[in-house]
């Protein structure tokens, strides 16, 4: 829950690994808390996808468009 007293992990891991699709990370994050609009300062963070702010971690996360992977949805998924 976003109002818990745990550390906000203010800039934690955006994806489990640089090779991992960020969409998987947001699915994981749902167990930790909900999402809010990304702060305006991250409007250019996700290259081929949309930004979501993980409330419990206070950090941005990218949900990649189909066919893109990477922390910032910056790479074409060759297996797509």
């Amino acid at each position: 829950d976003g109002n818990s007293t745990r550390s906000p992990e203010t800039n934690g891991l955006l994806c489990g690994d640089p090779e991992e699709n960020c969409a998987a990370t947001t699915t994981q994050s749902k167990r930790k808390g909900h999402f809010s609009r990304c702060p305006k300062q991250y409007k250019h963070y996700c290259i081929k996808g949309r930004c979501r702010f993980v409330v419990a971690e206070q950090t941005p996360s990218c949900v990649c468009d189909e066919g893109y992977i990477g922390a910032r949805c910056e790479r074409v998924d060759l297996f797509y």
Epitope: N11, L14, P39, Q41
Partner: antibody
């Protein structure tokens, strides 16, 4: 425990350059965004720059854009700030802080003095 | 740029007092606001994030409230170690701090 240790500050003439370093320990450095925040003597806090976990995304305050460059070496658990074309108004204590949005851990700071 | 205006700039209070510091953003920032405490010669310490969430390890006498443009930090019963300068910080449109509120001993 989380530790951030800045170094590289000192006295530099206007127009000169300086490179600050921030050595991190006590956490998995490569998983975290890191920022530089400064504080002029007797003044308030001013965010300077941040860099994402992998070093692919950076942003700067307007006051330093084009003059300062943030970078990181995850293999060395170290953050850097290359400061060029320094001005008197850059005189401040420079802190590295864990976070891009919020700053949950801070170093002790390093003093940069720009004066002739 | 979003400007953050804190009030008052300083205040005098006694141990046990209830202290309230306000912070106003020049435009709406939802709940993207943090509060920090700084003592002379030391680095700031995060107290509150997301406007009202207490950072781990911070005493429960500290609380935050507000959303949009108006925010408040409250210390329910001031302790000797709470005399310090407090800063608000918005993190919606990059990161900007208020000018600080110095809490002094009356």
């Amino acid at each position: 425990q989380v530790q951030l240790l800045e170094s590289g500050g000192g006295l530099v003439q206007p127009g000169g350059s300086l490179r600050l370093s921030c050595a991190a320990s006590g956490f998995t450095f490569s998983r975290y965004w890191i920022s530089w925040v400064r504080q002029a003597p007797g003044k308030g806090l001013e965010w300077v720059s941040y860099i994402d976990s992998w070093g692919s995304y950076t942003n700067y305050a307007d006051s330093v854009k084009g003059r300062f460059t943030i970078s990181r070496d995850n293999s060395k658990n170290t953050l850097y700030l290359q400061m060029n074309s320094l001005r008197a108004e850059d005189t401040a204590v420079y802190y590295c802080a864990r976070g891009g949005s919020l700053f949950d851990y801070w170093g002790q700071g390093t003093l940069v003095t720009v004066s002739s | 740029d979003i400007q953050m205006t804190q009030s008052p700039s300083s205040l005098s209070a006694s141990v046990g007092d209830r202290v309230t510091i306000t912070c106003r953003a020049s435009q709406g920032i939802i709940s993207y606001l943090g509060w920090y405490q700084q003592k002379p010669g030391k680095a700031p310490k995060l107290l509150i994030y997301a406007a009202s969430s207490l950072q781990s390890g911070v005493p429960s006498r500290f609380s935050g409230s507000g959303s949009g443009t108006d925010f408040t930090l409250t210390i329910s019963s001031l302790q000797p170690e709470d005399f310090a300068t407090y800063y608000c910080q918005q993190y919606d449109d990059f990161d900007t701090f208020g000018q600080g509120t110095k809490v002094e001993i009356k």
